[in-house]
């Protein structure tokens, strides 16, 4: 009986620790995508609608803020698309890129943690073009550090929640 009680307490402790594990999955806010052909910061993301969720992390001013030290898995998926109904591409040679950046407030500094993408030739003879980038990695993050996303050619972003998103989840504590 005592073993059973101990076991259930252990389960509860494990469960509450899991529930406290920080995570975030942020999806693009399609109503507020900036325009530009050079690298721009994407600051408008959903954190509480559709697939988007956040727990024990903070989303503020377009950045995902770490509240707990730890090792985190960070990921980003960015889709670019163009259909001829929206007009023509001003240039057919495109650099389609994503940059995942860490900013530290305590020691003012910024580092690109991950980047991905490609140069593309999107011919005007095609009705539709599509390109997807996925990056992911394991990083030591400290409380107060901020994660942000930059992309090239944001006017070509696919605005669907299953296409353009990024997130993080804590995997373990820092020993």
């Amino acid at each position: 009986e005592k073993a059973m009680v101990d076991g259930s307490w252990l389960d509860l402790a494990k469960r509450s620790k899991l529930e406290a594990q920080p995570f975030a999955h942020l999806t693009i806010n399609a109503t507020d995508i900036p325009s530009g052909s050079h690298k721009v910061s994407l600051s408008s993301w959903y954190h509480d609608r559709g697939w988007a969720k956040i727990s024990n992390m903070t989303f503020s001013n377009g950045k995902l803020i770490v509240n707990q030290d730890g090792f985190y898995y960070l990921y980003a998926n960015i889709c670019f698309r163009h259909h001829e109904t929206s007009g023509d591409l001003a240039t057919e040679y495109l650099q389609l890129m994503v940059y995942v950046t860490k900013t530290s407030i305590k020691i003012p500094s910024s580092h690109t943690l991950m980047k991905g993408g490609s140069t593309k030739y999107w011919s005007g003879n095609s009705e539709f073009h599509f390109y997807s980038i996925n990056v992911g990695g394991f990083f030591k993050l400290r409380s107060g550090e901020e994660i942000s996303i930059e992309v090239s050619n944001p006017s070509l972003l696919d605005p669907d929640q299953d296409a353009t998103y990024f997130g993080a989840f804590k995997v373990r504590d820092i020993d």
């Epitope: 052909s37 109904t85 929206s86 007009g87 591409l89 001003a90 240039t91 006017s155």
Partner: antibody, heavy 126, light 103 residues
């Protein structure tokens, strides 16, 4: 304020060429595209082609492919449209128009024309 | 190739009347539709872009609606200065125009 000022009326014989100019002022010429649109008597407006004033890229309607050339002089903030092998059906008012989305802000030529030239009447007659 | 079809081709209405012009696309064009006003001897004028956005400087009596393949331009209270031909447009394709006259 933004203005597009076109060259004056022209009369040409069939088989000849015509070159119409469109001088832009009041904005950064290189950051926008210029389209050419014409209207023949009693006809609908007809899109002919565009030029990205920044990089010189062009796109033309299949109908005019091979006999239209569109160029630009960024120093003079002027776009030019030359139409060759003229025929009587080319008698029309030719307009230049600015594409609204700024090329610095976006890469899509969206075909909405926020400013137009006053039009140039080209008459093709023997 | 997308074809734009406007109706009616002409209409006559009294000052103060509500006027509606319809534009149909041969296939879905989302909301990529613009409306222009043409007066003889004058430069064309952009009235509505993106199906329903009013271009700056255009009187609020002009409005646009629709999406997919069917769109309308409405003049809520026709004024003498609205006498013109109106064209819908999607990228490279224009409608055939609607001539608006005063009764």
């Amino acid at each position: 304020q933004v203005q597009l000022v076109q060259s004056g009326a022209e009369v040409r014989k069939p088989g000849a060429s015509v070159k119409v100019s469109c001088k832009a002022s009041g904005y950064d010429f290189s950051n926008y595209a210029i389209h050419w649109v014409r209207q023949a008597p009693g006809q609908r407006l007809e899109w002919m082609g565009w030029i990205n004033a920044g990089n010189g890229n062009t796109k033309f309607s299949q109908k005019f492919q091979g006999r239209i050339t569109v160029t630009r002089d960024t120093a003079a903030s002027t776009a030019y449209m030359e139409l060759r092998s003229l025929r009587s059906e080319d008698t029309a008012v030719y307009y230049c128009a600015r594409d609204s989305p700024n090329m610095v802000r976006g890469i899509i030529i969206a075909y909405y024309f926020d400013y137009w030239g006053q039009g140039t009447l080209v008459t093709v007659s023997s | 190739e997308i074809v734009m079809t406007q109706s009616p081709s002409s209409l006559s209405a009294s000052v103060g009347d509500r006027v509606t012009i319809t534009c149909r696309a041969s296939q879905s064009i989302s909301r990529y539709l613009n409306w222009y006003q043409l007066k003889p001897g004058k430069a064309p004028r952009l009235l509505i872009y993106g199906a329903s956005s009013l271009q700056s400087g255009v009187p609020s009596r002009f409005s646009g609606s629709g999406s997919g393949a069917e769109f309308t331009l409405t003049i809520s209270s026709l004024q003498p200065e609205d006498i013109a031909t109106y064209y819908c447009q999607h990228t490279r394709a224009f409608g055939q125009g609607t001539k608006v006259e005063i009764k």
